[in-house]
């Protein structure tokens, strides 16, 4: 849905001065029903990496066919291999279902680099370690696709939690989510913990590997450190947000804080990295440069094509600025901000250079439709998409990668004035926000 | 335009170290877009990466040499310089220094190397 | 480790002749590769970078293609100056450490 590295395709103005703090509204937010404790379950039901997706378990049909699902917070659509492929290990076999109904009706999503096509239809749907219930859902089997599957991913779908507004093949067609919670007494609201493995690993390792919990229905306080903050969700079609504004090592990049959310910013767990503006990448890139002056690397690094590696162990942390993104928050003048390390923007690539390296990728990288808070921030916190209240919290993830100086932090309140303005308002046309 | 210029001594005993510079001239060492490197390679053998520096004194080494290697750099005079320490004969080269431009990833330009013999 | 293999070893040819020199990667490095030529007790000297890209002051026949994993140099017709031998270097893994083993283009 996003261009450049978006999975599965491979990849305001500052206002009062930050010491000036407001009280917060609660400490803590009431207890509701199912909403909060533990969810034992579903803890660790994540597998993958930042590089290729985080995918979950899930079982369609009857009887149950078990596929791995890729979690995407940034489309609409369940949609699941249903043909042979060179990259699947298995594919959804309607035939096989007796539940199976053909909704006589085809799909097609095209990105900028590839597509997927399919047909739909709607069969029983389940999460082996999800919540206890199934649900009759709507899924696009696809029967076409280019450049949409990853070799060795090991998914074989992808699972749009997002809102039906950017369902395709229209906003009538109803997502996944919204099933689960019309058909169950399932709350509206789920979280994730992306786990980043904050070290290249080889392919049985991924296999092998945790990577991360998708709390449905609620949220477990073992996944986070410290304070859940909220921000608003600005309109319900991505996870659309407000930043305010955004600073490298403590320093503001004193942009106008329409361009960090021009034409939009999303929360979106189907992209590999944190994509901004043109302009706002100029000016990120230029001061993470000059931050880490006393190096100099290659210009396809910053573009993050050239990988660079160091002796193992020796990778120098220190010398990378930590970002901090300014969200707007849920009381009036208030902002508060998410802070990541290099530890999340620099993401370890399977060791190409030889066994005593830790190679890396410069993980942030530049949009034309807007700033995308993808993996390399979801790594750092847990994230919670609060439907039922529309608004998106954040928490330090308790399985963040850091070092003995620095961690990533979620702080606040601030004083951000006029932060309304901060939002871009996108002309209405009947274009595709996938061909973007 | 510029140039680059090895020196030091052509041998070398086993064991010993051993010392060569690389004097920069009609450009400034401290420019910050390129880094400073050496390059060897054996009589009749391919090259092989050495090392190299920026003018902060930031260096990067090949991991295969590193334990042995010190590579320096003196803005004041323009020059960098390469240190190979416990050498034996599997170290007779010819030692080139070069310069590593576009994008800090080509050796764009090179020195003409020195010949250093390790024998006792 | 990447590494990259260049072929034939040798290569005999005559002046005017068309030369295909290729260097293979054992993984992709993109287009992040170099060529380089080295003529009897000279240095090295930069031909053509980022695969395709001619370096300052290098002749028109000299020309470069390929990404990923192989990647060819391209001499369209061999003028005397020309037998040498000629290196591949890849700098997709940075440091930018790695050369090919090179190939010989002699006189016929």
């Known amino acids: 849905t996003q261009h450049g590295i978006r999975l599965p395709l491979r990849s305001g103005l500052g206002g009062a001065p930050l010491g000036l703090r407001l009280p917060r509204e609660t400490d803590e937010e009431p207890e509701e029903p199912g909403r909060r404790g533990s969810f034992v379950e579903m803890v660790d039901n994540l597998r993958g990496k930042s590089g290729q997706g985080y995918y979950v378990e899930m079982t369609v049909g009857s009887p149950p066919q078990t596929l791995n699902i890729l979690v995407d917070t940034g489309s609409s659509n369940f949609a699941v291999g249903a043909a042979p492929h060179p990259f699947l290990h298995r594919y959804y076999q309607r035939q096989l279902s007796s539940t199976y109904r053909d909704l006589r009706k085809g799909v097609y999503v095209p990105y900028t680099q590839g597509k997927w096509e399919g047909e739909l239809g709607t069969d029983l749907v389940s999460i082996p370690h999800g919540p206890n219930v199934t649900v009759r859902a709507n899924i696009a089997a696809i029967t076409e696709s280019d450049k949409f599957f990853i070799n060795g991913s090991n998914w074989e779908g992808i699972l749009g939690l997002a809102y039906a507004e950017i369902a395709r093949p229209d906003d009538s067609l109803e997502p996944f989510f919204d099933s689960l919670v019309k058909q169950t007494h399932v709350p509206n609201l789920f979280s994730l913990q992306l786990c980043g493995a904050g070290f290249p690993l080889n392919q049985s390792e991924v296999l092998a590997s945790v990577g991360g919990s998708m709390i449905i229905g609620g949220i477990d306080h073992s996944l986070y450190t410290g304070s859940l903050w909220y921000t608003p969700i600005r309109r319900e079609w991505y996870y659309e947000v407000i930043i305010v504004r955004v600073e490298i090592n403590g320093q503001d990049l004193k942009m106008d804080c329409k361009e960090y959310n021009y034409d939009k910013s999303i929360v979106d767990s189907g992209t590999t990295n944190l994509r901004l503006p043109k302009k706002v990448f100029e000016a990120a890139v230029k001061s993470i440069k000059a931050a880490s002056s006393t190096e100099k690397f290659p210009d396809g690094f910053w573009l993050g094509e050239q990988l660079v590696c160091w002796q193992a162990g020796t990778t120098p942390w220190n010398i990378f600025p930590v970002i901090s993104l300014y969200l707007m928050g849920e009381v009036t003048n208030q902002s508060f901000r998410i802070t990541i390390l290099p530890q999340q923007y620099l993401r370890p690539v399977e060791d190409v250079a030889t066994s005593q390296d830790d190679c890396y990728k410069f993980a942030i990288s530049q949009s034309s439709t807007g700033t995308v808070m993808g993996a390399v921030i979801m790594e750092g916190f847990y994230v919670v998409f609060d439907r039922a209240r529309k608004r998106i919290g954040f928490a330090v993830s308790a399985c963040h990668v850091h070092d003995e100086f620095r961690t990533a932090a979620v702080e606040g309140p601030f004083v951000t004035l006029d932060m309304e303005d901060c939002g871009y308002n996108i002309p209405q046309t009947d274009e595709s926000t996938l061909m973007t | 335009q510029l140039q680059l210029q090895e020196s030091g001594p052509g041998l070398v005993k086993p064991s010993e170290t051993l010392s060569l510079t690389c004097t920069v001239s009609?450009?400034?060492?401290?420019?910050?877009?390129?880094?400073w490197g050496w390059i060897r390679q054996p009589p009749g053998k391919g090259l092989e990466w050495i090392g190299m520096i920026y003018y902060s004194g930031s260096t990067w080494y090949n991991p295969s040499l590193k334990s042995r290697v010190t590579i320096s750099v003196d803005t004041s005079k323009n020059q960098f310089s390469l240190k190979l320490s416990s050498v034996t004969a599997a170290d007779t080269a010819v030692y080139y220094c070069?310069?590593?431009?576009?994008?800090?990833?080509?050796?764009?330009?090179w020195g003409r190397g020195t010949l250093v013999t390790v024998s006792s | 480790e990447i590494v990259l293999t260049q072929s034939p070893a040798t290569l005999s040819l005559s002046p005017g002749e068309r030369a295909t020199l290729s260097c293979r990667a054992s993984q992709s490095v993109s287009s992040y590769l170099a060529w380089y030529q080295q003529k009897p007790g000279q240095a090295p000297r930069l031909l053509i970078y980022?695969?395709?890209n001619r370096a300052t002051g290098i002749p028109a026949r000299f020309s470069g293609s390929g990404s990923g994993t192989d990647f060819t140099l391209t001499i369209s017709s061999l003028e005397p100056e020309d037998f040498a031998v000629y290196y591949c270097?890849?700098?997709?893994?940075?440091?930018?450490?790695?050369f090919g083993g090179g190939t010989k283009v002699e006189i016929k």
């Open positions: 270097q890849q700098a997709y893994v940075w440091p930018p450490r790695t």
């Open positions: 980022d695969a395709s």
């Open positions: 009609g450009g400034s060492i401290s420019r910050g877009s390129y880094y």
């Open positions: 070069a310069r590593v431009g576009h994008g800090v990833s080509y050796f764009d330009l």
